[in-house]
């Protein structure tokens, strides 16, 4: 899989490029410099920076917590009026307690009604989610295996035979019509049977070409 090994024998280099073992490393390999430079930041400086970052994060969390407290305070102040007890005697205070208790009972009733609605909505959402999963189950897509190939081989596999057509993979994979559902299900079965045969690049090429 590694390329350029013959060149390495003829021309010795001061820092050889790291051997790519996976195609997933390709992008990183292309963007990174071949010779890795040693970090100029000392361990103590790194620790200092880490501590600083932690401090900033802590301050940010504290600020968020303070904001939440402030928001709660603001919300409560709009809902709960400050008690006006000046000039009220025992009789009024007693009656005020009765009024406030009645208000609490009313709010409790409303809360119960809202909770019932929320529970109903949660149940409906769960049912709909289940229906979505059930519908998805009818149109299973093949699970593609990761294949270790070079970038050139991959480009050839993708563009070689069908260079003229655009590579809109979604269009290829998602063209499902209602009348073809049975056919699709049969295909899914075939995929499972021939999974080993199709796991190679040739098999994948065949699938794209069909």
């Amino acid at each position: 899989m590694a390329d350029g090994s013959s060149d390495a024998a003829r021309e010795p280099r001061p820092a050889p490029a790291p051997i790519r073992r996976r195609s997933s490393n390709y992008r990183a390999y292309a963007t990174e410099p071949h010779a890795k430079k040693k970090s100029k930041i000392s361990a103590s400086r790194k620790l200092q920076l880490k501590t600083l970052l932690l401090q900033i994060a802590k301050q940010e969390l504290e600020r968020e917590a303070e904001e939440r407290r402030g928001e709660k305070g603001r919300a409560l102040s709009t809902r709960c009026q400050p008690l006006e007890l000046a000039g009220l005697g025992f009789a009024e205070l007693q009656d005020l307690c009765r009024q406030l208790h009645a208000r609490v009972d009313k709010v409790d009733e409303e809360r119960y009604d809202i909770e019932a609605k929320v529970t109903k909505n949660i149940t409906e959402i769960a049912d709909l989610t289940q229906k979505i999963f059930d519908l998805r189950g009818k149109f299973k897509r093949p699970t593609l295996r990761r294949v270790r190939i070079s970038a050139d081989a991959m480009m050839q596999a993708l563009l070689g035979a069908r260079a003229k057509e655009s590579l809109d993979l979604r269009a290829h994979l998602k063209q499902v019509k209602k009348e073809d559902t049975e056919k699709e299900n049969r295909e899914v079965g075939d995929w499972r049977k021939n999974i080993d045969a199709l796991s190679g690049m040739e098999g994948r090429k065949k699938k794209f070409e069909s």
Epitope: L88, F90, D95
Partner: antibody
């Protein structure tokens, strides 16, 4: 000098509505709870309504609850009594009074001159 | 509701007399009892609050006493300006209630 002046009274038919006003002066109005008390033609005194200093809380006897509404405007030093669905038994002299308390005891320490309301068909 | 009752609706007395007006509550009102005076012109004034406290500007000839359910207002050395109707009011429970009043007249 503490003073209360009522206005807005009159003669009206049963089922009618009326709004009484009371202009207060001579004291820091917003520091006191206020009340309305009426006196029937038989000279009986009946407490009608009380409102807290900022207007958040109001108190009524069952006889007027749901029909009468006490309110206040601290900026204008004015107390109001909105009366709806008036009945013949609401016929009375309506007094505006400053309310105070001592060790929890509730009393009206200063009263206005009254405003007459007559409900008759 | 707490009912307030006075022993007599009217009372006759002579100038200089000591007059006592009584008031009873249908239940214990813990001294939350107030007395008012209404003059013939309709003017209402607070005289006594919390059973025995004299309101500012009120003559010391007026005094109040009592506890539990029984209370009284006393006018010592009755004067012409005291001729009025006197009401008691409980400040213990909503609704605040008044008695029917005692009309004080000269003999």
């Amino acid at each position: 000098e503490v003073q209360m002046v009522e206005s807005g009274g009159g003669l009206l038919k049963p089922g009618g509505s009326l709004k009484l006003s009371c202009a207060a002066s001579g004291f820091t109005y917003s520091n006191y709870a206020m009340s309305w008390v009426r006196q029937t033609p038989e000279k009986r005194l009946e407490w009608v309504a009380t409102i807290s200093t900022g207007g958040s809380y109001s108190y009524y006897p069952d006889s007027v609850k749901g029909r009468f509404t006490i309110s206040r405007d601290n900026a204008k030093n004015t107390l109001y009594l909105q009366m709806l669905s008036l009945r013949s038994e609401d016929t009375a002299m309506y007094y505006c009074a400053r309310k105070d308390n001592y060790y929890g005891s509730t009393f009206m320490d200063y009263w206005g001159q009254g405003s007459s309301v007559t409900v008759s068909s | 509701d707490i009912q307030m009752t006075q022993t007599s609706s009217s009372l006759s007395a002579s100038l200089g007399d000591r007059v006592t007006i009584s008031c009873r509550a249908s239940q214990d009102i813990t001294q939350y009892l107030n007395w008012y005076q209404q003059k013939p012109d309709g003017t209402i004034k607070l005289l006594i609050y919390y059973s025995s406290r004299i309101h500012s500007g009120v003559s010391s000839r007026f005094s109040g006493s009592g506890s539990g359910t029984d209370y009284s207002l006393t006018i010592s050395n009755l004067e012409q300006e005291d001729i009025a109707t006197y009401f008691c009011q409980q400040g213990n429970t909503i609704p605040l209630t008044f008695d029917t009043g005692t009309k004080l007249e000269l003999k």
